[in-house]
């Protein structure tokens, strides 16, 4: 699986999850998030060679097409597969609110 | 929606579904598919600017991050959203077989 366990431990050029820390205030300009100050959102990148973690029959076909026709611009792309939520604390006036934001952290990638 | 109805009628630079005809024999080297000779698989391509058809909270956050930090290498990618099956005819010996291959035709795209 192209997950953090594998990808963070290996120098992998092909599609894999990469570490990306986002500071809410500095990187996004969000002052409203009180806690945490930032988080590892991570992201997916890298080429999708033939049969690499293909998501659908279409991505398998497109991967084969791209391998046989390397001049073609059509190829699968490395995108998030498994995501996890992030719990944040913010304020509305003086009232603290705790909210779980779904699909905030990329844990693994796929070729789609 | 970034679907064939919209994308095939407009000169759209950003994420959209693009027409791609694949000839089974010529493009994939598949001689075993008897009918059809080929089909429109289509593919997704184009940049994913801020808020464009974002798939998850992560892709929204990543789109904002990329807009504010354009030198960053992390950005959402344009990938298939809705796919349709394709029915094919092939032979096992002299016995004809009809099979429906799932997720073969891209009908719309999203930024993931």
């Amino acid at each position: 699986a192209l997950d953090t366990n594998y990808c963070f431990r290996n120098l992998e050029e092909n599609c894999c999850v990469r570490p990306l820390y986002i500071d809410f205030r500095q990187d996004l300009g969000w002052k409203w998030v009180h806690e945490p100050k930032g988080y590892y959102a991570n992201f997916c990148s890298g080429p999708c060679p033939y049969l690499r973690s293909a998501d659908t029959t279409h991505s398998t076909v497109l991967g084969l097409y791209n391998t046989l026709n390397p001049e073609a611009s059509a190829s699968p792309c490395c995108v998030p597969q498994d995501l996890e939520p992030l719990t944040i604390l913010y304020y509305v006036g003086r009232t603290p609110k705790v909210e779980q934001l779904s699909n905030m952290v990329v844990k693994s990638c796929k070729c789609s | 929606a970034l679907d064939t109805n919209y994308c095939f009628r407009n000169l759209e630079e950003n994420c959209c579904v693009r027409p791609l005809y694949i000839d089974f024999r010529q493009d994939l080297g598949w001689k075993w598919v008897h009918e059809p000779k080929g089909y429109y698989a289509n593919f997704c391509s184009g940049p994913c600017p801020y808020l464009r058809s974002a798939d998850t909270t992560h892709s929204t956050v990543l789109g904002l991050y990329n807009t504010l930090n354009p030198e960053a290498s992390a950005s959402p990618c344009c990938v298939p959203q809705d796919l349709e099956p394709l029915t094919i005819l092939y032979y096992v010996g002299r016995t004809p077989k009809v099979e429906q291959l799932s997720n073969m035709v891209v009908k719309s795209c999203k930024c993931s």
Epitope: G29, W30, K31, W32 | L51, T57, L64
Partner: nanobody
Amino acid sequence: QVQLVESGGGLVQPGGSLRLSCAASGITFSHYDMAWFRQAPEKQRELVALITSGGKTAYADSVKGRFAISRDNAKNTVYLQMNSLKAGDTAVYYCNAHWVLTSQYWGQGTQVTVSS
């Protein structure tokens, strides 16, 4: 009920200036990232300028150095100062409010026409 009301559009000569305003109601304005998009005839809606809840800004390459986005949280209003206007800036300009915890909201748009 959320409302975004744009104003300030109109007809202006090339090289002239306009200031667009977008007044928001029904949202916790200070939490929202605010943006201006525009749509010219037969073209896709495109981002012009963005200002986050904390005041971080970004601009489309085509307007950098000419347009300036700002916000006034006390007045629940976002502004777009447009200078050195060109014919290519002609479009309907839309205000957008986005917060990651809710859906995004759009204004009805204001027409900007740059012509001599």
